[in-house]
Interface confidence: low
């Protein structure tokens, strides 16, 4: 009588993560009597996947009813496949023995490869804000994909970026892989509304890539420009001086007026106006009583923006001349002082 053969007809099976893998196995004879077991891997370290005789294997179901007489189909299904399930599976026939069953014959093995989708890319930017013209780095990470081949692209407002470095780990064989990419982006003053996008394409995504985004509003700091101007007279001895704070982001800003170096008033930007590019404008004014001053008055508008060193702009107010004859901005300076005000 012909000796029993264990046939695994599929050399390899490719399954998407989350799906069910069918591993086929048939025997050519009912003799010798004894159970079938499925293992992943070979040798002493092999892992038991299914034992027809005993045990409990929630993810494994048999294709046919193994308890029925004359059954020679020992195919199994493994549900909810993950990349960790990848490997070579062997269908092994045992011969009934005492006290233990003895391994009789093994199939040639079926290699299970798992296609796993990459996780949604996570984009993270620098910890601290940076100003226009500076180069900042963004990282993009995606994990858990298989096979290893993957494509990553970076975009800024729809325009593809070229200055980036990408690594896929691990370098060798693995059940799943991770990708890490760092892109360098040069900031411009118009970037408050800009977005950086990391796009990952993989065979499991069927042409519909995954995207992760970062808003440059979280990264950029646009420092303000200051302009101090003298307004027409409001009353005989009063001059109205305004400080225009333009094109700044984020909104956090504190302004201090100094008269001849002495703090006159401090205020925090509240009712700002927003520009189309996302930056803000704000105006503060100071009413100066000229008759209270003997000499010329140096008015300074000092601004501390987003915790940065203060910048200032000054305006000389000549008290010797009649207020109505005052010119606008007769003398102005941008000190860019490093001193922080103590409010």
């Amino acid at each position: 009588e012909e000796e029993l053969q264990v046939i695994q007809p599929d050399k390899s099976v490719l399954v998407a993560a989350g799906e069910t893998a069918t591993l086929r196995c048939t025997a050519t004879s009912l003799i010798p009597v004894g159970p079938i077991q499925w293992f992943r891997g070979a040798g002493p370290g092999r892992e038991l996947i299914y034992n027809q005789k005993e045990g409990h294997f929630p993810r494994v179901t048999t294709v046919s009813d193994l308890t029925k007489r004359n059954n020679m189909d020992f195919s199994i299904r493994i549900g909810n496949i993950t990349p960790a399930d990848a490997g070579t599976y062997y269908c092994v026939k045992f011969r009934k023995g005492s006290p233990d069953d003895v391994e009789f014959k093994s199939g040639a093995g079926t290699e299970l490869s798992v296609r796993a989708k990459p996780s949604a890319p996570v984009v993270s930017g620098p910890a601290a804000r940076a100003t226009p013209q500076h180069t900042v780095s963004f990282t993009c990470e995606s994990h858990g994909f298989s096979p290893r081949d993957i494509t990553l692209k970076w975009f800024k407002n729809g325009n593809e970026l070229s200055d980036f470095q990408t690594n896929v780990d691990p370098v060798g064989e693995s059940v799943s892989y991770s990708i890490h990419s760092t892109a360098k982006v040069v900031l411009t003053r118009e970037d408050v509304h800009s977005q950086v996008i990391c796009e990952v394409a993989h065979v499991t995504l069927q042409g519909d890539p995954l995207r992760g985004t970062a808003n440059l509003s979280e990264t950029i700091r646009v420092p303000p420009t200051l302009e101090v101007t003298q307004q027409p007279v409001r009353a005989e001895n009063q001059v109205n001086v305004t400080c225009q704070v333009r094109k700044f982001y984020p909104q956090r800003l504190q302004l201090t007026w100094l008269e001849n170096g002495n703090v006159s008033r401090t205020e925090t930007a509240s009712t700002v106006t927003e520009n189309k590019d996302g930056t803000y404008n704000w105006m503060s004014w100071l009413l100066v009583n000229v008759s209270a001053h003997r000499d010329d008055v140096k008015l300074t508008c000092q601004v501390e923006h987003d915790g940065q060193p203060a910048v200032s702009k000054s305006h000389d107010l000549k008290v010797s001349a009649h207020p109505k004859e005052q010119g606008s901005n007769t003398a102005a300076e941008n000190t860019g002082s490093n001193e922080r005000n103590i409010y």
């Epitope: 892992e47 038991l48 996947i49 299914y50 045990g55 409990h56 294997f57 929630p58 993810r59 494994v60 549900g79 909810n80 993950t82 960790a84 858990g144």
Partner: antibody, heavy 124, light 107 residues
């Protein structure tokens, strides 16, 4: 002895997030799955999700998808469960529990060790 | 998701009585069913796994059985310390759903 020690009670406002920790001791942390189960006042047990401390892979109940994140720190044998966008109906006792097993089990046989529970109150 | 229908939701019995709780699965879950005991203010405790296996250290008055998708949990002789809520749970398919619970009280 084998035990799971959870972080203390939390009071949160609607819309906020909460992160509960569960520190394992007395066994090999990476050899057993960890699950999170919650129990609203006077209600039954609700399975939230499972994490494999070895690789960090997770599976969440559909109900919590997008709001729950389970992570682990193998250096401290601690798992974490973060629930975001909290609402009043998330007020509950949150338990971590170890999944025991034997032989080859895809999802082992049951939760044989439990944390003491962390009460999370969501109130405006 | 697999639905686990547990009944009754509560029961009252005398010390020494035989108490039976049932749990029905919405689909075939093999023997993959556990029973837990939860006392007020405490975490649940695993009593029975794989439908009928007693967890180490659990008294032998607790038992479990299966018939198809119907599972039965029995306390052969109710003791005062058995006052608790009992839950079934399937452990074969994620999410690992629980039954609604049965509160057991002493008459």
């Amino acid at each position: 002895q084998v035990q799971l020690v959870q972080s203390g009670a939390e009071v949160k406002k609607p819309g906020a997030s909460v992160k509960v920790s569960c520190k394992a001791s007395g066994y090999t942390f990476t050899s057993y799955y960890m699950v999170w189960v919650r129990q609203a006042p006077g209600q039954g047990l609700e399975w939230m999700g499972i994490i494999n401390p070895s690789g960090g892979s997770t599976s969440y109940a559909q109900k919590f998808q997008g709001r729950v994140t389970m992570t682990r720190d193998t250096s401290t044998s601690t798992v974490y469960m973060e629930l975001s966008s909290l609402r009043s109906e998330d007020t509950a006792v949150y338990y971590c529990a170890r999944e025991g097993g034997y032989g080859y089990r895809a999802y082992p046989y049951g939760m044989d060790v439990w944390g003491q529970g962390t009460t999370v109150t969501v109130s405006s | 998701d697999i639905q686990m229908t547990q009944s009754p939701s509560s029961l009252s019995a005398s010390v020494g009585d035989r108490v039976t709780i049932t749990c029905q699965a919405s689909q075939d879950i093999s023997n993959s069913l556990n029973w837990y005991q939860q006392k007020p203010g405490k975490a649940p405790k695993l009593l029975i796994y794989d439908a009928s296996n007693l967890e180490t250290g659990v008294p032998s008055r607790f038992s479990g059985s299966r018939s198809g998708t119907d599972f039965t949990f029995t306390i052969s002789s109710l003791q005062p310390e058995d006052i608790a809520t009992y839950y079934c749970q399937q452990v074969i398919i994620l999410p690992l759903t629980f039954g609604g619970g049965t509160k057991v009280e002493i008459k």
